[in-house]
């Protein structure tokens, strides 16, 4: 609500103001009456039976001070012209309100020409005979405003033109937007402007321990003509370590924290933190617990995970499938990833070294989220040790590692990959391949083939190369073909059995 600063209050003055009447001794008259058992003063006039009335009542000179626009509140009563005998033909039911600005008090020197009319004042309710007799004062309240005022002071004047009117209260005031705390900003008491459409912009200052948030607007309010604050812009927020309590920022209690300027309250220190002092912006982690750089301060402190719980390495020829289960202790985090590293050892020499360059993983071996991976292109008759390390967001903050290892010996080469290169009615041309690292260990390749459905007889061809043509075959017949590498240490893993069909005599020309 707007704050009113009173410049003139006739009702409160108890008849002591001594306003000027013109003409002197006629028209307006100061009188006392009793209302609600209290004496009240009023200026009244009731020359309704005589025409051409021009009775003036002028206030004392009122110092303007800092007011720009003044508000004039009038409380008055007007008698019904019909309540007089014959309706009092010259009777009126309105009066006029005037003002004049001046830099000095003219005293009893009254000049009508200096006054500017503000408005004609008409009652909402007139006092009829029955009200008058019963002493029911039909009080009207009218308010007008004038501005901008520029001189040191002013007068008000009331012109009677033949009404029966009593002025019970004349209150002149200006409006201020009151001192205000809003949005944790303090706005000073501000004089309301004089122009109705315009709003005075007032900058606010953040209360103690409050700040304008980064990228936020400075707090501003607009003081309207009627003394009301309008259109708040921007705000202040309690800084880190402080929370809003009513219109102030209060330090977080011990055991609580607030890590940034925000609207949120202080939060209780999360798990695995040490008790915080008053006004804390964060809570330190217990020993052995950590916070990753991207972790919010509200998150509990965490630690690195334990090692993967259970690790198996299953060899399949020249491939190994590694499987493991998540760590039993996640460290309180969900961002666990796994890294797989490989080491190979030569049985003859016992020499070992990393093998990342020579093996192939089914997916990149670092930052794995799944709990299995297949490693292929392993060399036969080699010992491999695989290490699976579990890591989370805080693993980088400690030197220790959480891992489990599994070893496996590769006794066979990987099965060759077989392709049909060509065929005729009596022959099949077949080729194969094995990973280059394993080729040096192969002495010869053994190709076994037989007619499909004939389990009693089969044929074997050996070759050092990577292809062979099988001749003397029956036309339009399906053959089962398998290729196996032979090494100094024995047989490698056989390929899968392929079904290849020779051409029929009719289709041989195609």
């Amino acid at each position: 609500q707007g704050k009113e600063v009173v410049l003139l209050d006739f009702a409160a003055a108890g008849g002591e103001l001594g306003w000027l009447t013109h003409p002197y001794g006629k028209g307006w008259d100061l009188m006392q009456n009793i209302m609600n058992d209290m004496p009240i003063y009023m200026y009244s006039v009731c020359n309704v039976m005589s025409g051409d009335q021009d009775n003036w009542l002028r206030t004392n000179w009122v110092y303007r001070g800092e007011a720009e626009r003044i508000f004039i509140e009038l409380k008055f009563t007007v008698r019904d012209c019909n309540s007089f005998p014959g309706g009092a033909s010259s009777c009126k039911e309105t009066f006029n309100l005037y003002y004049a600005e001046s830099d000095l008090d003219y005293g009893t020197n009254f000049q009508k020409r200096l006054f500017t009319k503000i408005d004609t004042i008409a009652p909402d309710e007139i006092t009829v005979s029955s009200d008058f007799e019963a002493r029911h004062v039909k009080l009207n309240v009218e308010e007008r405003s004038v501005g901008p005022l520029t001189r040191k002071g002013f007068y008000l004047a009331f012109q009677d033109i033949g009404a029966c009117v009593a002025l019970l209260s004349v209150r002149v005031y200006y409006k201020k937007c009151p001192e205000l705390l809003q949005g944790l900003a303090h706005f000073p008491e501000t004089i309301a402007g004089s122009d109705a459409p315009s709003l005075a912009t007032v900058a606010g200052t953040c209360v103690d321990h409050a700040v304008v948030p980064p990228g936020g607007e400075e707090p501003r309010m607009h003081c309207a003509v009627d003394g009301e604050w309008l259109v708040p812009i921007g705000q202040c927020l309690c800084q880190a370590g402080y929370e809003k309590v009513e219109d102030a920022c209060q330090a977080c209690s011990p055991g609580f924290f607030k890590f940034e300027a925000s609207e949120s309250p202080c939060l209780e220190c999360p798990e695995h933190t040490l008790p915080s002092p008053e006004g804390a912006t964060s809570c330190e982690c217990e020993e052995g617990f950590f916070r990753a750089p991207q972790d919010p301060a509200s998150m509990p402190c965490t630690r690195p995970p334990s090692a993967p719980h259970y690790l198996t390495a299953v060899g399949m020829g020249a491939k190994v499938e590694l499987r493991w289960t998540p760590p039993q202790d996640s460290g309180g985090r969900e961002d666990i990833v796994y890294s797989v590293t490989c080491e190979q050892c030569w049985p003859e020499s016992g020499e070992c070294g990393p093998c990342e360059a020579s093996v192939r993983y089914s997916e990149p071996p670092h930052g794995l989220t799944r709990t299995s991976v297949t490693v292929s292109d392993l060399e036969p008759h080699m010992n491999y040790t695989f290490t699976v390390e579990a890591r989370n967001g805080v693993s980088g903050l400690v030197t220790s590692r959480s891992f489990r290892t599994a070893s496996v010996s590769i006794n066979q080469t990987e099965p060759p990959k077989v392709r049909l290169e060509g065929r005729s009615t009596t022959s099949l041309s077949v080729s194969w391949s094995i990973p280059p690292p394993q080729q040096s260990r192969v002495w010869k390749y053994e190709v076994t083939y037989r007619k499909k459905g004939d389990s009693n007889s089969y044929n074997v061809r050996r070759t050092e190369g990577f292809s062979v043509t099988l001749d003397d075959l029956a036309p339009d017949t399906t053959y089962l073909v398998q290729v196996q590498a032979l090494t100094q240490e024995g047989q490698g893993a056989g390929s899968k059995v392929h079904e290849f069909q020779t051409l029929s005599p009719e289709g041989s020309g195609n």
């Epitope: 009188m31 007007v78 005979s129 007799e133």
Partner: antibody, heavy 128, light 107 residues
Framework: EVQLLESGGGLVQPGGSLRLSCAAS????????MAWVRQAPGKCLEWVSR????????HYADSVKGRFTISRDNSKNTLYLQMNSLRAEDTAVYYC?????????????????????WGQGTLVTVSS | DIQMTQSPSSLSASVGDRVTITCRAS??????LAWYQQKPGKAPKLLIY???NLHTGVPSRFSGSGSGTEFSLTISGLQPDDFATYYC?????????FGCGTKVEIK
């Protein structure tokens, strides 16, 4: 022309009763506040009682409160004063008086009334 | 009750004289005062109300003034018809008290 004519006065013994009447004419009786004012021989005027235009409110001087009753009959344009438990000090000429707010050229009514029209009076003598 | 004191209690004057009668209230009555004229054997007649307002039909040689506790009735240019007793009455309270009158006699 406004006329007020009192009647009902006379000689009465102390403790006795009397009813005064005031017949009104020449004006709208129901618009007027009416009152009784008395004047003891060689003494000041003394207000006795008043009644509003519609029959209320009524007021009494302390000296007659509880003994006198003012009333009116607007249909008969008549004002009454019932006087009981009369005393010697009630001996006086009793005037009927009227007030019409329409002739009171003031913006706010006074705390009480004055009297614009008066009757010729009727003498009440209380004596044993 | 409010006491009303008139002075003088009687005065002698000649036709054409200016006569002033005063009335004092025992406490402030603002301007709630009326003046009446009464001739022997007749009813009182209203002259002035609200201290200075002339009642309808009353000659303008009668005037009233004052406020608070001091009031006066002035007859400027006394006429033969004006020889009578004059009463003041306050109506600031329900007791509506009268003064005891000032008798204006022919000198």
């Amino acid at each position: 022309e406004v006329q007020l004519l009192e009647s009902g006065g006379g000689l009465v013994q102390p403790g006795g009763s009397l009813r005064l009447s005031c017949a009104a004419s020449g004006f709208t009786f129901s618009h007027y506040m009416m009152a009784w004012v008395r004047q003891a021989p060689g003494k000041c005027l003394e207000w006795v009682s008043r009644i509003g235009p519609s029959g209320g409110p009524t007021h009494y001087a302390d000296s007659v409160k509880g003994r006198f009753t003012i009333s009116r009959d607007n249909s008969k344009n008549t004002l009454y004063l019932q006087m009981n438990s009369l005393r010697a000090e009630d001996t006086a000429v009793y005037y009927c008086a009227g007030y019409d707010s329409g002739y009171d050229y003031v913006a706010v009514a006074g705390p009480a009334e004055y009297f614009q029209h008066w009757g010729q009076g009727t003498l009440v003598t209380v004596s044993s | 009750d409010i006491q009303m004191t008139q002075s003088p209690s009687s005065l002698s004057a000649s036709v054409g004289d200016r006569v002033t009668i005063t009335c004092r209230a025992s406490q402030s009555i603002s301007t709630w005062l009326a003046w009446y004229q009464q001739k022997p054997g007749k009813a009182p007649k209203l002259l002035i109300y609200k201290a200075s307002n002339l009642h309808t039909g009353v000659p303008s040689r009668f005037s009233g003034s004052g406020s608070g506790t001091e009031f006066s009735l002035t007859i400027s240019g006394l006429q033969p018809d004006d020889f009578a007793t004059y009463y003041c009455q306050q109506y600031n309270s329900y007791s509506r008290t009268f003064g005891c009158g000032t008798k204006v006699e022919i000198k």
